[in-house]
Amino acid sequence: QTSVSPSKVILPRGGSVLVTCSTSCDQPKLLGIETPLPKKELLLPGNNRKVYELSNVQEDSQPMCYSNCPDGQSTAKTFLTVYWTPERVELAPLPSWQPVGKNLTLRCQVEGGAPRANLTVVLLRGEKELKREPAVGEPAEVTTTVLVRRDHHGANFSCRTELDLRPQGLELFENTSAPYQLQTFVLPATPPQLVSPRVLEVDTQGTVVCSLDGLFPVSEAQVHLALGDQRLNPTVTYGNDSFSAKASVSVTAEDEGTQRLTCAVILGNQSQETLQTVTIYSFPAPNVILTKPEVSEGTEVTVKCEAHPRAKVTLNGVPAQPLGPRAQLLLKATPEDNGRSFSCSATLEVAGQLIHKNQTRELRVLYGPRLDERDCPGNWTWPENSQQTPMCQAWGNPLPELKCLKDGTFPLPIGESVTVTRDLEGTYLCRARSTQGEVTRKVTVNVLSPRYE
């Protein structure tokens, strides 16, 4: 009778084991072991027992002890089970961002590992087991579907293998994959709201605001604002689940025409975009042309108004005839026209909007000087010793210089408060002088003495 010890062995891949082959007869003709494994016999006293060191055991094997005794030949097998942890435990790659409400399939691949009967694959979210299955096939694959929720954001999913050799007196060997960190997001189906001027004048600045509600996580949202090829640099303010991106946009003559304003919101692997057209226009203020800005009284003056070729103008409220970009009027300058404003208003239609521009010029009329009864009375009668203020106003443009003299030397204090004395009595010659000429006027002052009262 042949026996083997141990009859069952579990050992690590590449390991060695001592196997003892024994026989019940004292003088066996033959005692040995049959195995493809490298073997080394350890010398022992006696003939009925042999010990072999079997090395580099790579896979399950069944070495067989045999003996040849007088009563016949017999054999005994030992069962060598090789164990090794899986070579690779991996979650199939997934996009890191997943939309809330979508089904996410987690797939774990396990390469190798033995004995497979003791190998289990576990899919986990954090420490919570999602699925547990025996490892079958090469590679062993375990899949599970997860409905992505908002509170899964930042959760780690992983795959663990458990080679449980505790029933064989060994330990539980665990291998864990690199974790997959899930980033969940919500990007609403509604496009972002874009508020901007529909028209924008060359060499001016406008403000563009792009906003969207119902985002998660809002801090991860990327906002791209652009006008044509010009990327805008917005200032973004965040709410709980909303953002507002505000940017200043400057346009030049090169941008003239219809431009596309875009606001794109990118979150995870999705985006929402809003497009709007902005018409960039050039519209200089109309030009008011006076033949001369300063004319003498009685001169003929032409006032012209010229604007953008597509504009319609009115000059001093009177529309151009025919309606168009030019208007003019003729007048003979009078003193009343001095300081008169000529206002030209131009209206241009841009993308359905009416844009108004105004320009005003003032006419200066040179006239005078003038001294008349209303402003410089020819006769004053004042009681002696009373307080009086002689008034004489000369008119003209430029304003004339005025002097009133008695006998060519004694001045009448115009505009000053004086005590009336006898010396004040007499006839004064008032002379108003300017670049436009001079006029004179006689003014008589009468003083009433108290004895006549």
């Epitope: 691949q109 390469e111 190798g112 079958v136 096939g137 090469e138 590679p139 690199a178």
Partner: antibody, heavy 120, light 112 residues
Framework: QVQLVQSGAEVKKPGASVKISCKGS????????LHWVRQAPGQRLEWMGV????????DYNQKFRGRATITVDTSASTAYMELSSLRSEDTAVYYC?????????????WGQGTALTVSS | DVVLTQSPLSLPVTLGQPASISCRSS???????????LHWYQQRPGQSPRLLIY???NRFSGVPDRFSGSGSGTDFTLKISRVEAEDVGVYFC?????????FGGGTKLEIK
């Protein structure tokens, strides 16, 4: 003992297709993946692709994707590699080799090889 | 693709003498799990390749202990402590760390 036995030598014309078989025995066929490797004259060994004999999943070297197709018939414990649109550069010895799916423990047993000659 | 460069191309050795073959990789062969999937094969004349060493230094079943492998990262070596007549053939290194898997150009071992 583990054995991988491949089909015999083939001579094909350019533009034709060839299908080589590889039958596994002496082990549980679905416990291992099968890889295909070729050796052209004067060239280094070239990995072509792999099949999971359990699930039928495949992975290919980009160089052969679209031209090579690896399939399996588990009931016959046989894997197949079909190469289409043959050209003279495909003249080589084609081997199947047993391994783990990602080859992490090396290709431990190889078939005897199938010689393919592509010539007009 | 990862390029494996073997040297020397040809290796004449006297029987009983040691032999050493080098394999250098164009990038590290350490996988993200810390393992290095670099293997060595022997191809005797007229035969299929045969696995000698897997994962840098593990001898496969039935491979004599005169064969040993070492190295890390990008530099690896196959050593034969005492060359025997049956060792004649071409030796290849191979990597299964990066996709697609690649082989070295081979080193031809011959007896002087």
């Amino acid at each position: 003992q583990v054995q991988l036995v491949q089909s015999g030598a083939e001579v094909k014309k350019p533009g034709a297709s060839v299908k080589i078989s590889c039958k596994g025995s002496g082990y549980t066929f679905t416990d291992y993946a099968l890889h295909w490797v070729r050796q052209a004259p004067g060239q280094r060994l070239e990995w072509m692709g792999v099949i999971s004999t359990y699930s039928g999943n495949t992975d290919y070297n980009q160089k052969f994707r679209g031209r090579a197709t690896i399939t399996v018939d588990t009931s016959a414990s046989t894997a197949y590699m079909e190469l289409s649109s043959l050209r003279s550069e495909d003249t080589a010895v084609y081997y199947c080799a047993r391994s783990l799916y990602f080859g992490s423990s090396g290709f431990d047993y190889w078939g005897q090889g199938t010689a393919l000659t592509v010539s007009s | 693709d990862v390029v494996l460069t073997q040297s020397p191309l040809s290796l004449p050795v006297t029987l009983g003498q040691p032999a050493s073959i080098s394999c250098r990789s164009s990038q590290t062969l350490v996988y993200r799990n810390g393992n290095t999937y670099l293997h060595w094969y022997q191809q005797r004349p007229g035969q299929s390749p045969r696995l000698l060493i897997y994962k840098v230094s593990n001898r496969f079943s039935g491979v004599p202990d005169r064969f040993s492998g070492s190295g890390s990262g990008t530099d690896f070596t196959l050593k034969i402590s005492r060359v025997e007549a049956e060792d004649v053939g071409v030796y290849f290194c191979s990597q299964n760390t990066h996709f697609p898997y690649t082989f070295g150009g081979g080193t031809k071992l011959e007896i002087k």
